[in-house]
């Protein structure tokens, strides 16, 4: 398990002509928020799935009103990270969709209106536990700058968050920089060390000593940008101009744009113009609607009939987040007392109690009467570290909560019959005996063998 974190640095007009108008105006002040959708793998099949790795919605940004005559600036952003928890292994390769939404705060009937300003998508390699990766994506005339990383949540560790490192009863004595691991509890794990010099921004490793490059970078240490020139062989050294002897295949050859997208070459690569409902580098990603099932954990999807309209997930108890992807952290309320360890099993909370304490919330002190309530007038008796409830007549069980059968112990002597009574028991004695428990024989002359006073 772990968390994918996305930090938006700026959203504003991109470079070049055709700068967009500000999305907000004096008449219609607005604020931005962002949505991220994650899907595993790099394959187009995986890209067709809903946000299988999870999704998250940012907070709303500050309200912005356009200044008349001023160019559109970078727009004010919401505070904080977008966090997408993932429960299983981090896949290492993933697709992302980041949507920029505008919330108009005018006097709309029925509350604020939402509209999608921009949507960017990409496919990346990323090892969990690595440094922040920076990225710039353009959507039309807009430019989005952001960083992202995946980190494991304790006790998970490793590039895929599949190893567990959980100190059991107490901190480990592993050497400096090492940490104890379970289920291989009898070893100490060294932090992963990539090949010396491996670029922290563009490289990562899944095994010690290797250096694997993120998309767009190459070389043994991932420090060389991938060339985007379409030349197969350069001109000879005498040539004063750069160019190609033989034109190589162009980036749009074979049309890399899926789903009917049209390809146009750019100075560095190519760009796909996608038909409505598709987006991504190669138009391989379809818009997320309620039909895609974006609400996790049994959430109810409302609205969002077409890709450019928003949907809302109504989450069941125990879940939250824009896609019901976050389990409410019930352990944060610290329900386990006396140092107990809280475990959220989903269907229930469990407390694992420290020695000497017990009960659903570790509320009972096993060693003294203070932690034990004896019901129905019972009294707690302790001694030598042990304790028990001494129950009032007619009650039994560990806490005197059970109605005892007063006749179960056969209290009537000499064949007397026992009858349970609301206040205890009554013995009907056999002929020749008397007393509350039929313990005294009756002498033939009518006198009873009562003990002397």
């Amino acid at each position: 398990a772990g968390v994918f974190e996305l930090q938006i640095h700026s959203f504003g007009p991109g470079p070049g002509p055709g700068a967009p108008r500000s999305p907000c105006s004096a008449r219609l002040p607005c604020r931005l928020f962002f949505r991220v959708c994650l899907k595993p793998g790099l394959s187009e099949e995986a890209a067709e799935s809903p946000c299988a790795l999870g999704a998250a919605l940012s907070a709303r940004g500050p309200v912005y009103t356009e200044q008349p005559g001023a160019p559109a600036p970078d727009l004010p952003l919401p505070d904080g990270l977008l966090q997408v928890p993932f429960r299983d292994a981090w896949p290492g390769t993933f697709s992302f969709i980041i949507e920029t939404w505008r919330e108009e705060l005018g006097d709309q009937i029925g509350g604020p209106a939402w509209s999608l300003l921009a949507r960017v998508a990409g496919r990346r390699r990323l090892a969990a536990g690595g440094p922040w990766a920076r990225d710039i994506q353009r959507a039309g005339a807009w430019e989005l700058r952001f960083s992202y990383r995946a980190r494991c949540e304790p006790p998970a560790v490793g590039t895929a968050c599949t190893r567990l490192c959980r100190p059991r009863s107490a901190p480990s004595r592993c050497g400096p920089g090492l940490r104890p691991c379970a289920p291989l509890e009898d070893e100490c794990e060294a932090p992963l060390v990539c090949r010396a010099g491996c670029s922290p921004e563009h490289g990562f490793c899944e095994q010690p000593g290797e250096c694997r490059c993120l998309e767009g970078w190459t070389g043994p240490l991932c420090t060389v940008p991938v060339s985007t020139s379409s030349c197969l062989s350069p001109r000879g050294p005498s040539s004063a101009t750069t160019g190609c002897l033989v034109p190589g295949p162009g980036p749009c050859d074979g049309n890399p744009c899926a789903n009917g997208g049209s390809c146009s070459e750019t100075p560095r690569s190519f760009e796909c113009t996608c038909p409505r409902g598709f987006y991504g580098l190669r138009c391989e990603v379809s818009g997320v609607t309620c039909a895609d099932g974006p609400c996790f954990n049994g959430g109810l999807c409302v609205g969002g009939a077409d890709p450019d309209s928003a949907y809302i997930c109504h989450c069941p108890p125990g879940f939250q987040g824009s896609n019901c992807e976050k389990r409410v952290d019930r352990c944060s309320l610290q329900p386990c007392r006396n140092g107990g360890l809280c475990l959220d099993l989903g269907h229930a909370l469990r407390c694992r109690c420290r020695a000497g304490f017990a009960g659903p919330r570790c509320e009972h002190d096993l060693d003294d009467c203070a932690g034990r309530a004896c019901a129905n007038g019972g009294t707690c008796v302790e001694g030598g570290g042990a304790h028990r409830c001494s129950c009032a007549l007619g009650f039994g069980g560990r806490d005197c909560r059970e109605r005892a059968d007063p006749c179960a112990a056969r209290p009537c002597a000499h064949g007397g019959r026992c009858y349970a009574h609301f206040s205890g028991l009554v013995c009907a004695c056999a002929p020749g005996y008397m007393g509350a428990r039929c313990e005294f024989p009756v002498h033939p002359d009518g006198a009873s063998a009562l003990p002397a006073a």
Partner: antibody, heavy 119, light 107 residues
Framework: EVQLVESGGGLVKPGGSLRLSCAAS????????MSWVRQAPGKGLEWVGR??????????DYAAPVKGRFTISRDDSKNTLYLQMNSLKTEDTAVYYC??????????WGQGTLVTVSS | DIQMTQSPSSLSASVGDRVTITCQAS??????LNWYQQKPGKAPKLLIY???NLETGVPSRFSGSGSGTDFTFTISSLQPEDIATYYC?????????FGGGTKVEIK
């Protein structure tokens, strides 16, 4: 790696004394309750006694058969648990295990040390 | 003292069989019960705590259930490495007491 290593076992005559030690490593010994459990040859497990952490009072509790004869103590500075056994009887013959009792269970066990009481 | 009565004292089963061991407490101990496995010549190992919770790293074929006075320990599909003696243990009250053990063998 949690390790508990018992030492001090051996052959002793009835009425004699023996002191067992348990060297602990791989966890914060001072925070942890510790116990001794024994197992007579071919028999089941029998709890001997326990000592709480100093932060929980450091008190001791014993099973009836050893009460008054055995004493459990700890030296947190040395990460060591002790079992002082006096007035030994033949029925005290057993493998003695040192155990960590952090949760309400014997979480980790040593390999055990054999104590033989025989004339 | 709380007496823990385990049954059977020994059993023989085939690989893949479902094996069930019972443990009965002489009084109500809620779910304050643990199960241990002891292989020949080795120290015991905690398998189940609080009657039904699997200890970290223990295979899921082991399970426990019960509350009050009657408890059950189950191996859903017996494996050769499960040859051992299994003990229940209560911690409701001092002295801490163990069941007499159940020796599991392969047919």
């Amino acid at each position: 790696e949690v390790q508990l290593v018992e030492s001090g076992g051996g052959l002793v005559k009835p009425g004699g004394s023996l002191r067992l030690s348990c060297a602990a490593s791989g966890f914060t010994f001072s925070n942890t309750w510790m116990s001794w459990v024994r197992q007579a040859p071919g028999k089941g497990l029998e709890w001997v006694g326990r000592i709480k952490s100093k932060s929980d009072g450091g008190t001791t509790d014993y099973a009836a058969p050893v009460k008054g004869r055995f004493t459990i103590s700890r030296d947190d500075s040395k990460n060591t648990l002790y079992l002082q056994m006096n007035s030994l009887k033949t029925e005290d013959t057993a493998v003695y295990y040192c155990t960590q009792y952090y949760w309400n269970s014997f979480d980790y066990w040593g390999q055990g040390t054999l104590v033989t009481v025989s004339s | 003292d709380i007496q823990m009565t385990q049954s059977p004292s020994s059993l023989s089963a085939s690989v893949g069989d479902r094996v069930t061991i019972t443990c009965q407490a002489s009084q109500d101990i809620s779910n304050y019960l643990n199960w241990y496995q002891q292989k020949p010549g080795k120290a015991p190992k905690l398998l189940i705590y609080d009657a039904s919770n699997l200890e970290t790293g223990v295979p899921s074929r082991f399970s426990g259930s019960g509350s009050g006075t009657d408890f059950t320990f189950t191996i859903s599909s017996l494996q050769p490495e499960d040859i051992a003696t299994y003990y229940c243990q209560q911690y409701d009250n001092l002295p801490l007491t163990f069941g007499g053990g159940t020796k599991v063998e392969i047919k």
